[in-house]
Amino acid sequence: MRKTRLWGLLWMLFVSELRAATKLTEEKYELKEGQTLDVKCDYTLEKFASSQKAWQIIRDGEMPKTLACTERPSKNSHPVQVGRIILEDYHDHGLLRVRMVNLQVEDSGLYQCVIYQPPKEPHMLFDRIRLVVTKGFSGTPGSNENSTQNVYKIPPTTTKALCPLYTSPRTVTQAPPKSTADVSTPDSEINLTNVTDIIRVPVFNIVILLAGGFLSKSLVFSVLFAVTLRSFVP
Protein backbone atom coordinates (compact mmCIF):
# COMPACT_ATOMS: atom_id res chain seq x y z
CA MET A 1 0.00 0.00 0.00
CA ARG A 2 2.81 2.36 1.01
CA LYS A 3 4.70 1.40 -2.13
CA THR A 4 1.69 2.14 -4.37
CA ARG A 5 1.15 5.50 -2.74
CA LEU A 6 4.79 6.44 -3.23
CA TRP A 7 4.68 5.42 -6.89
CA GLY A 8 1.56 7.50 -7.35
CA LEU A 9 3.30 10.47 -5.78
CA LEU A 10 6.34 10.01 -8.00
CA TRP A 11 4.25 9.86 -11.15
CA MET A 12 2.26 12.93 -10.08
CA LEU A 13 5.52 14.82 -9.55
CA PHE A 14 6.86 13.69 -12.88
CA VAL A 15 3.70 14.54 -14.81
CA SER A 16 3.40 17.96 -13.14
CA GLU A 17 7.04 18.73 -13.92
CA LEU A 18 6.50 17.63 -17.50
CA ARG A 19 3.45 19.86 -17.81
CA ALA A 20 5.48 22.76 -16.43
CA ALA A 21 8.01 22.15 -19.18
CA THR A 22 5.35 22.63 -21.84
CA LYS A 23 4.34 26.10 -20.66
CA LEU A 24 6.52 27.69 -23.32
CA THR A 25 3.94 29.05 -25.71
CA GLU A 26 4.26 30.29 -29.24
CA GLU A 27 2.23 32.63 -31.37
CA LYS A 28 1.97 31.63 -34.99
CA TYR A 29 1.90 34.28 -37.70
CA GLU A 30 1.40 33.63 -41.38
CA LEU A 31 2.55 36.40 -43.70
CA LYS A 32 3.29 36.75 -47.37
CA GLU A 33 6.66 37.49 -48.92
CA GLY A 34 7.38 41.23 -48.96
CA GLN A 35 5.25 41.98 -45.91
CA THR A 36 6.50 43.38 -42.61
CA LEU A 37 6.45 41.70 -39.22
CA ASP A 38 6.02 44.34 -36.51
CA VAL A 39 6.54 42.92 -33.03
CA LYS A 40 6.34 44.80 -29.73
CA CYS A 41 8.08 43.07 -26.85
CA ASP A 42 6.79 44.42 -23.57
CA TYR A 43 9.43 44.45 -20.82
CA THR A 44 7.46 46.55 -18.33
CA LEU A 45 10.05 47.12 -15.63
CA GLU A 46 12.28 50.20 -15.53
CA LYS A 47 15.31 48.21 -14.45
CA PHE A 48 15.40 46.70 -17.95
CA ALA A 49 15.19 50.06 -19.73
CA SER A 50 18.87 50.52 -20.52
CA SER A 51 19.70 46.81 -20.74
CA GLN A 52 20.84 45.50 -24.09
CA LYS A 53 18.07 43.66 -25.90
CA ALA A 54 18.20 41.21 -28.77
CA TRP A 55 16.10 39.50 -31.42
CA GLN A 56 16.95 35.84 -31.77
CA ILE A 57 16.04 32.90 -33.98
CA ILE A 58 15.77 29.43 -32.48
CA ARG A 59 16.52 26.60 -34.85
CA ASP A 60 15.75 23.00 -33.91
CA GLY A 61 18.55 21.46 -31.89
CA GLU A 62 20.60 24.65 -31.89
CA MET A 63 21.27 27.40 -29.41
CA PRO A 64 19.36 30.66 -29.97
CA LYS A 65 21.15 32.78 -32.54
CA THR A 66 21.18 36.55 -32.12
CA LEU A 67 20.21 38.31 -35.34
CA ALA A 68 20.20 41.89 -34.05
CA CYS A 69 20.59 43.71 -30.77
CA THR A 70 20.32 47.18 -29.33
CA GLU A 71 23.36 49.13 -28.20
CA ARG A 72 24.83 48.70 -24.76
CA PRO A 73 23.48 50.51 -22.87
CA SER A 74 20.33 50.56 -24.95
CA LYS A 75 19.53 54.03 -26.26
CA ASN A 76 16.01 55.41 -26.11
CA SER A 77 14.05 55.30 -29.39
CA HIS A 78 17.28 55.02 -31.36
CA PRO A 79 16.77 52.69 -34.34
CA VAL A 80 19.32 49.94 -34.83
CA GLN A 81 19.23 48.30 -38.23
CA VAL A 82 20.83 44.98 -39.14
CA GLY A 83 19.93 44.04 -42.68
CA ARG A 84 16.16 43.83 -42.83
CA ILE A 85 15.74 43.89 -39.05
CA ILE A 86 15.12 47.16 -37.21
CA LEU A 87 15.08 47.43 -33.42
CA GLU A 88 13.75 50.43 -31.49
CA ASP A 89 13.77 50.53 -27.71
CA TYR A 90 11.21 52.84 -26.12
CA HIS A 91 12.40 53.10 -22.52
CA ASP A 92 9.60 55.25 -21.20
CA HIS A 93 6.89 52.83 -22.30
CA GLY A 94 8.87 49.65 -21.71
CA LEU A 95 8.56 48.51 -25.30
CA LEU A 96 11.07 46.98 -27.68
CA ARG A 97 9.84 47.26 -31.25
CA VAL A 98 11.17 44.73 -33.74
CA ARG A 99 10.46 45.01 -37.43
CA MET A 100 11.44 42.49 -40.08
CA VAL A 101 10.81 44.06 -43.44
CA ASN A 102 10.47 42.60 -46.92
CA LEU A 103 9.95 39.11 -45.50
CA GLN A 104 11.29 36.12 -47.42
CA VAL A 105 10.18 32.48 -47.27
CA GLU A 106 13.51 31.59 -45.67
CA ASP A 107 12.73 33.95 -42.75
CA SER A 108 10.23 31.36 -41.52
CA GLY A 109 11.14 30.09 -38.08
CA LEU A 110 10.85 30.53 -34.35
CA TYR A 111 11.90 33.90 -32.87
CA GLN A 112 12.16 35.53 -29.47
CA CYS A 113 13.06 38.83 -27.82
CA VAL A 114 15.54 38.64 -24.97
CA ILE A 115 17.11 41.03 -22.50
CA TYR A 116 20.80 40.58 -21.83
CA GLN A 117 21.63 40.79 -18.13
CA PRO A 118 25.16 39.46 -17.69
CA PRO A 119 26.39 37.58 -15.78
CA LYS A 120 22.88 36.16 -15.50
CA GLU A 121 21.14 34.28 -18.29
CA PRO A 122 19.26 36.34 -20.88
CA HIS A 123 15.64 37.02 -20.00
CA MET A 124 13.13 35.91 -22.61
CA LEU A 125 10.13 38.10 -23.32
CA PHE A 126 6.94 36.15 -23.99
CA ASP A 127 5.65 34.86 -26.30
CA ARG A 128 7.90 33.22 -28.83
CA ILE A 129 6.93 33.99 -32.39
CA ARG A 130 6.47 31.23 -34.95
CA LEU A 131 6.76 33.03 -38.26
CA VAL A 132 5.56 31.35 -41.42
CA VAL A 133 6.28 33.28 -44.62
CA THR A 134 4.54 32.05 -47.76
CA LYS A 135 5.12 32.93 -51.41
CA GLY A 136 3.09 35.48 -53.31
CA PHE A 137 1.72 38.93 -52.49
CA SER A 138 -1.58 39.38 -50.74
CA GLY A 139 -2.61 42.04 -53.24
CA THR A 140 -3.76 44.32 -50.44
CA PRO A 141 -2.64 47.92 -50.89
CA GLY A 142 -0.08 48.97 -48.35
CA SER A 143 0.59 45.46 -47.17
CA ASN A 144 3.73 44.68 -49.14
CA GLU A 145 5.98 47.09 -51.06
CA ASN A 146 4.54 50.18 -49.44
CA SER A 147 5.15 48.99 -45.92
CA THR A 148 8.66 47.95 -46.84
CA GLN A 149 9.44 51.34 -48.35
CA ASN A 150 8.06 53.12 -45.31
CA VAL A 151 10.23 51.12 -42.99
CA TYR A 152 13.36 52.08 -44.87
CA LYS A 153 12.65 55.78 -44.32
CA ILE A 154 15.01 55.72 -41.36
CA PRO A 155 17.76 58.28 -40.78
CA PRO A 156 21.09 57.19 -42.23
CA THR A 157 22.56 57.55 -38.72
CA THR A 158 21.04 54.17 -37.87
CA THR A 159 23.72 52.13 -36.15
CA LYS A 160 24.61 48.49 -36.05
CA ALA A 161 25.22 47.41 -32.47
CA LEU A 162 27.76 44.86 -31.36
CA CYS A 163 25.96 41.89 -29.87
CA PRO A 164 27.40 39.80 -27.03
CA LEU A 165 29.63 36.98 -28.18
CA TYR A 166 27.81 34.37 -26.16
CA THR A 167 24.39 32.98 -26.88
CA SER A 168 22.86 31.16 -23.99
CA PRO A 169 21.99 27.51 -24.52
CA ARG A 170 19.05 27.96 -22.17
CA THR A 171 17.19 31.21 -21.94
CA VAL A 172 15.51 32.04 -18.67
CA THR A 173 11.81 31.73 -19.25
CA GLN A 174 8.77 32.24 -17.11
CA ALA A 175 5.07 32.02 -17.73
CA PRO A 176 3.56 35.32 -18.90
CA PRO A 177 2.39 37.14 -15.79
CA LYS A 178 -1.18 38.19 -15.18
CA SER A 179 -1.74 41.88 -14.79
CA THR A 180 -1.49 41.92 -11.02
CA ALA A 181 0.88 39.02 -10.49
CA ASP A 182 3.79 40.45 -8.56
CA VAL A 183 6.68 39.29 -10.65
CA SER A 184 9.90 40.88 -11.75
CA THR A 185 9.48 39.29 -15.15
CA PRO A 186 8.58 41.11 -18.33
CA ASP A 187 5.36 40.31 -20.09
CA SER A 188 4.74 40.80 -23.77
CA GLU A 189 2.18 41.31 -26.41
CA ILE A 190 2.83 40.74 -30.06
CA ASN A 191 1.26 42.96 -32.66
CA LEU A 192 1.37 43.06 -36.41
CA THR A 193 0.81 45.97 -38.73
CA ASN A 194 0.05 46.06 -42.46
CA VAL A 195 -1.05 42.46 -42.37
CA THR A 196 -4.29 41.12 -43.76
CA ASP A 197 -3.69 37.41 -43.48
CA ILE A 198 -3.04 36.69 -39.82
CA ILE A 199 -3.49 33.43 -37.98
CA ARG A 200 -2.91 33.52 -34.23
CA VAL A 201 -2.63 29.97 -32.90
CA PRO A 202 -0.86 28.82 -29.73
CA VAL A 203 1.45 26.08 -31.02
CA PHE A 204 2.94 23.26 -28.98
CA ASN A 205 5.60 21.27 -30.72
CA ILE A 206 4.65 18.09 -28.91
CA VAL A 207 7.67 16.04 -29.92
CA ILE A 208 10.23 18.68 -28.93
CA LEU A 209 8.40 19.59 -25.75
CA LEU A 210 7.99 15.98 -24.67
CA ALA A 211 11.61 15.23 -25.45
CA GLY A 212 12.71 18.37 -23.64
CA GLY A 213 10.45 17.55 -20.73
CA PHE A 214 11.77 14.03 -20.42
CA LEU A 215 15.39 15.09 -20.78
CA SER A 216 15.20 17.92 -18.28
CA LYS A 217 13.23 15.95 -15.74
CA SER A 218 14.88 12.57 -16.23
CA LEU A 219 17.63 13.24 -13.71
CA VAL A 220 15.14 14.18 -11.00
CA PHE A 221 13.03 11.17 -11.87
CA SER A 222 16.02 8.81 -11.89
CA VAL A 223 17.14 9.99 -8.45
CA LEU A 224 13.63 9.65 -7.05
CA PHE A 225 13.31 6.23 -8.65
CA ALA A 226 16.64 5.06 -7.22
CA VAL A 227 15.79 6.36 -3.75
CA THR A 228 12.41 4.69 -3.87
CA LEU A 229 13.88 1.34 -4.97
CA ARG A 230 16.56 1.53 -2.31
CA SER A 231 13.94 2.14 0.37
CA PHE A 232 12.18 -1.12 -0.55
CA VAL A 233 15.29 -3.29 -1.02
CA PRO A 234 15.96 -5.26 2.17
Epitope: K40, D42, T44, L45, E46, K47, S50, D92, R97, D182
Partner: antibody
Framework: EVQLVESGGGLVQPKGSLKLSCGAS????????MHWVRQAPGMALEWVAR??????????YYADSVKDRFTISRDDSQNMLYLQMNNLKTEDTAMYYC????????????WGQGTLVTVSA | DIVLTQSPASLAVSLGQRATISCRAS??????????LHWYQQKPGQPPKLLIY???NLESGIPARFSGSGSRTDFTLTINPVEADDVATYYC?????????FGGGTKLEIE
Protein backbone atom coordinates in the same frame (compact mmCIF):
# COMPACT_ATOMS: atom_id res chain seq x y z
CA GLU B 1 -0.77 39.87 -1.24
CA VAL B 2 0.41 43.39 -2.06
CA GLN B 3 -0.41 45.85 0.71
CA LEU B 4 -0.30 49.64 0.72
CA VAL B 5 -1.14 51.49 3.93
CA GLU B 6 -1.40 55.28 4.00
CA SER B 7 -1.04 57.46 7.08
CA GLY B 8 -0.48 61.07 8.04
CA GLY B 9 -3.80 62.56 6.99
CA GLY B 10 -5.74 64.94 9.18
CA LEU B 11 -7.03 68.49 9.62
CA VAL B 12 -4.70 71.30 8.61
CA GLN B 13 -5.14 75.03 8.11
CA PRO B 14 -4.75 76.74 4.75
CA LYS B 15 -1.08 77.49 3.94
CA GLY B 16 -0.12 74.74 6.37
CA SER B 17 1.95 71.61 5.70
CA LEU B 18 1.41 67.89 6.04
CA LYS B 19 3.44 64.81 5.18
CA LEU B 20 1.70 61.64 4.04
CA SER B 21 3.35 58.24 4.29
CA CYS B 22 2.63 54.94 2.60
CA GLY B 23 4.04 51.65 3.81
CA ALA B 24 4.37 48.96 1.17
CA SER B 25 4.70 45.22 1.68
CA UNK B 26 4.65 41.87 -0.11
CA UNK B 27 6.28 43.05 -3.32
CA UNK B 28 9.67 44.23 -4.50
CA UNK B 29 9.12 47.90 -3.74
CA UNK B 30 12.24 49.22 -5.48
CA UNK B 31 11.15 47.68 -8.78
CA UNK B 32 8.04 49.78 -9.33
CA UNK B 33 7.10 53.39 -9.86
CA MET B 34 4.72 54.67 -7.19
CA HIS B 35 1.94 57.25 -7.36
CA TRP B 36 -0.37 59.40 -5.29
CA VAL B 37 -3.95 59.81 -6.50
CA ARG B 38 -6.53 61.92 -4.72
CA GLN B 39 -10.30 62.31 -4.69
CA ALA B 40 -12.10 65.34 -3.33
CA PRO B 41 -15.45 64.56 -1.66
CA GLY B 42 -18.04 63.69 -4.33
CA MET B 43 -15.55 64.40 -7.11
CA ALA B 44 -13.59 62.42 -9.69
CA LEU B 45 -10.20 60.83 -9.21
CA GLU B 46 -7.17 63.06 -9.80
CA TRP B 47 -3.64 61.82 -10.35
CA VAL B 48 -1.25 63.82 -8.15
CA ALA B 49 2.33 62.60 -8.53
CA ARG B 50 4.61 59.79 -9.66
CA UNK B 51 8.09 58.74 -8.65
CA UNK B 52 10.10 56.33 -10.72
CA UNK B 53 12.73 53.82 -9.61
CA UNK B 54 16.44 54.18 -8.91
CA UNK B 55 17.23 52.99 -12.45
CA UNK B 56 15.40 56.12 -13.66
CA UNK B 57 17.16 58.30 -11.09
CA UNK B 58 13.99 58.61 -9.02
CA UNK B 59 12.48 60.97 -11.59
CA UNK B 60 9.35 62.73 -10.35
CA TYR B 61 6.25 64.06 -12.13
CA TYR B 62 3.38 66.19 -10.84
CA ALA B 63 -0.09 67.37 -11.75
CA ASP B 64 -0.12 71.08 -12.57
CA SER B 65 -2.43 71.74 -9.61
CA VAL B 66 0.21 70.65 -7.09
CA LYS B 67 3.46 71.54 -8.85
CA ASP B 68 5.92 73.49 -6.65
CA ARG B 69 3.82 72.76 -3.56
CA PHE B 70 3.95 68.95 -3.24
CA THR B 71 7.02 66.71 -3.23
CA ILE B 72 6.90 62.96 -3.76
CA SER B 73 9.76 60.86 -2.41
CA ARG B 74 10.56 57.28 -1.53
CA ASP B 75 12.79 55.27 0.78
CA ASP B 76 13.45 51.91 -0.86
CA SER B 77 15.28 50.58 2.20
CA GLN B 78 12.13 51.08 4.29
CA ASN B 79 9.59 50.32 1.55
CA MET B 80 8.06 53.74 2.13
CA LEU B 81 6.49 56.34 -0.15
CA TYR B 82 5.95 59.94 0.97
CA LEU B 83 4.06 63.05 -0.11
CA GLN B 84 5.21 66.31 1.44
CA MET B 85 2.40 68.86 1.02
CA ASN B 86 3.18 72.54 1.57
CA ASN B 87 1.15 75.73 1.19
CA LEU B 88 -2.05 73.71 1.36
CA LYS B 89 -5.26 75.10 -0.10
CA THR B 90 -8.87 74.27 0.70
CA GLU B 91 -9.15 72.59 -2.70
CA ASP B 92 -6.50 70.07 -1.61
CA THR B 93 -9.09 68.53 0.72
CA ALA B 94 -9.41 64.95 -0.47
CA MET B 95 -8.84 61.28 0.18
CA TYR B 96 -5.25 60.55 -0.81
CA TYR B 97 -4.47 57.09 -2.20
CA CYS B 98 -1.07 55.46 -2.47
CA UNK B 99 -0.94 53.48 -5.72
CA UNK B 100 1.39 50.97 -7.34
CA UNK B 101 1.38 50.44 -11.08
CA UNK B 102 2.32 47.34 -13.08
CA UNK B 103 5.43 48.80 -14.66
CA UNK B 104 6.33 51.58 -17.04
CA UNK B 105 3.23 53.61 -17.84
CA UNK B 106 1.11 50.61 -16.93
CA UNK B 107 -2.21 50.33 -15.14
CA UNK B 108 -2.81 51.06 -11.46
CA UNK B 109 -3.21 47.55 -10.11
CA UNK B 110 -2.87 48.16 -6.38
CA TRP B 111 -4.46 50.87 -4.25
CA GLY B 112 -4.25 51.63 -0.55
CA GLN B 113 -7.40 52.39 1.44
CA GLY B 114 -6.56 56.09 1.49
CA THR B 115 -5.93 58.76 4.10
CA LEU B 116 -8.18 61.81 4.43
CA VAL B 117 -6.69 65.30 4.30
CA THR B 118 -8.93 68.18 5.29
CA VAL B 119 -7.74 71.74 4.71
CA SER B 120 -9.94 74.16 6.59
CA ALA B 121 -9.69 77.29 8.70
CA ASP C 1 -2.49 67.64 -20.96
CA ILE C 2 -4.68 64.88 -22.33
CA VAL C 3 -8.30 65.47 -21.36
CA LEU C 4 -10.53 62.41 -20.99
CA THR C 5 -14.25 63.03 -21.44
CA GLN C 6 -16.60 60.34 -20.20
CA SER C 7 -20.19 60.01 -21.25
CA PRO C 8 -22.80 59.75 -20.01
CA ALA C 9 -22.16 61.25 -16.57
CA SER C 10 -24.77 58.90 -15.16
CA LEU C 11 -26.51 55.85 -16.52
CA ALA C 12 -29.53 53.84 -15.38
CA VAL C 13 -29.81 50.32 -16.76
CA SER C 14 -32.18 47.43 -16.05
CA LEU C 15 -30.76 44.25 -14.56
CA GLY C 16 -29.64 41.88 -17.29
CA GLN C 17 -29.29 44.64 -19.87
CA ARG C 18 -26.17 46.10 -21.46
CA ALA C 19 -24.41 49.21 -20.14
CA THR C 20 -22.06 51.13 -22.41
CA ILE C 21 -19.73 53.87 -21.18
CA SER C 22 -17.68 56.02 -23.53
CA CYS C 23 -14.32 57.68 -22.93
CA ARG C 24 -12.94 60.15 -25.47
CA ALA C 25 -9.37 61.47 -25.32
CA SER C 26 -8.37 64.94 -26.54
CA UNK C 27 -5.41 63.29 -28.32
CA UNK C 28 -4.23 59.78 -29.01
CA UNK C 29 -3.26 57.67 -26.01
CA UNK C 30 -1.59 55.05 -28.21
CA UNK C 31 2.09 54.25 -28.52
CA UNK C 32 2.51 52.06 -31.59
CA UNK C 33 -0.73 50.10 -31.43
CA UNK C 34 -0.76 49.85 -27.64
CA UNK C 35 -3.51 51.91 -26.03
CA UNK C 36 -2.45 53.11 -22.59
CA LEU C 37 -6.06 53.51 -21.45
CA HIS C 38 -7.47 51.72 -18.42
CA TRP C 39 -10.86 51.35 -16.71
CA TYR C 40 -11.60 51.31 -12.97
CA GLN C 41 -14.68 50.65 -10.84
CA GLN C 42 -15.22 52.52 -7.58
CA LYS C 43 -17.87 51.79 -5.00
CA PRO C 44 -18.74 54.28 -2.22
CA GLY C 45 -16.18 54.31 0.60
CA GLN C 46 -13.76 52.07 -1.29
CA PRO C 47 -10.62 52.66 -3.37
CA PRO C 48 -10.94 52.13 -7.12
CA LYS C 49 -10.52 48.64 -8.57
CA LEU C 50 -8.86 47.87 -11.91
CA LEU C 51 -11.23 46.28 -14.43
CA ILE C 52 -9.64 46.63 -17.85
CA TYR C 53 -6.08 47.53 -18.73
CA UNK C 54 -4.65 48.74 -22.03
CA UNK C 55 -8.11 49.26 -23.55
CA UNK C 56 -9.24 45.65 -23.85
CA ASN C 57 -7.42 43.35 -21.41
CA LEU C 58 -9.57 41.94 -18.64
CA GLU C 59 -7.91 42.16 -15.25
CA SER C 60 -7.46 38.88 -13.42
CA GLY C 61 -10.50 38.00 -11.28
CA ILE C 62 -12.86 40.39 -13.08
CA PRO C 63 -15.99 38.75 -14.56
CA ALA C 64 -16.14 38.39 -18.34
CA ARG C 65 -19.30 40.53 -18.29
CA PHE C 66 -16.89 43.46 -18.42
CA SER C 67 -15.17 44.23 -21.70
CA GLY C 68 -13.26 47.11 -23.20
CA SER C 69 -12.62 48.23 -26.74
CA GLY C 70 -11.27 51.13 -28.76
CA SER C 71 -8.00 52.73 -29.77
CA ARG C 72 -6.32 56.11 -30.18
CA THR C 73 -8.98 58.53 -28.91
CA ASP C 74 -12.24 56.58 -28.62
CA PHE C 75 -12.81 53.88 -26.02
CA THR C 76 -15.77 51.97 -24.64
CA LEU C 77 -16.43 49.98 -21.50
CA THR C 78 -19.28 47.50 -21.82
CA ILE C 79 -21.01 45.61 -19.02
CA ASN C 80 -23.27 42.86 -20.31
CA PRO C 81 -25.38 41.70 -18.58
CA VAL C 82 -25.53 44.26 -15.78
CA GLU C 83 -25.87 42.84 -12.26
CA ALA C 84 -26.91 44.55 -9.03
CA ASP C 85 -23.31 44.42 -7.78
CA ASP C 86 -22.19 46.63 -10.68
CA VAL C 87 -23.70 49.76 -9.14
CA ALA C 88 -20.65 52.01 -8.89
CA THR C 89 -18.79 54.87 -10.56
CA TYR C 90 -16.55 53.96 -13.50
CA TYR C 91 -13.43 55.89 -14.51
CA CYS C 92 -11.16 55.75 -17.52
CA UNK C 93 -7.48 56.75 -17.13
CA UNK C 94 -4.63 57.33 -19.55
CA UNK C 95 -0.97 56.67 -18.78
CA UNK C 96 0.49 57.34 -22.20
CA UNK C 97 1.67 60.85 -21.34
CA UNK C 98 2.49 62.90 -18.27
CA UNK C 99 0.53 64.08 -16.48
CA UNK C 100 -1.60 60.95 -16.14
CA UNK C 101 -5.28 61.88 -16.27
CA PHE C 102 -8.65 60.40 -15.33
CA GLY C 103 -12.04 60.85 -16.91
CA GLY C 104 -14.80 62.59 -14.95
CA GLY C 105 -16.51 59.31 -14.11
CA THR C 106 -19.79 57.63 -15.01
CA LYS C 107 -22.23 56.67 -12.27
CA LEU C 108 -24.08 53.43 -13.02
CA GLU C 109 -27.44 52.82 -11.37
CA ILE C 110 -30.10 50.15 -11.71
CA GLU C 111 -33.45 51.39 -12.97
Amino acid sequence: EVQLVESGGGLVQPKGSLKLSCGASDFTFNTYAMHWVRQAPGMALEWVARIRTKSSNYATYYADSVKDRFTISRDDSQNMLYLQMNNLKTEDTAMYYCVRDMGQRRQFAYWGQGTLVTVSA
Amino acid sequence: DIVLTQSPASLAVSLGQRATISCRASESVDTFDYSFLHWYQQKPGQPPKLLIYRASNLESGIPARFSGSGSRTDFTLTINPVEADDVATYYCQQSNEDPYTFGGGTKLEIE
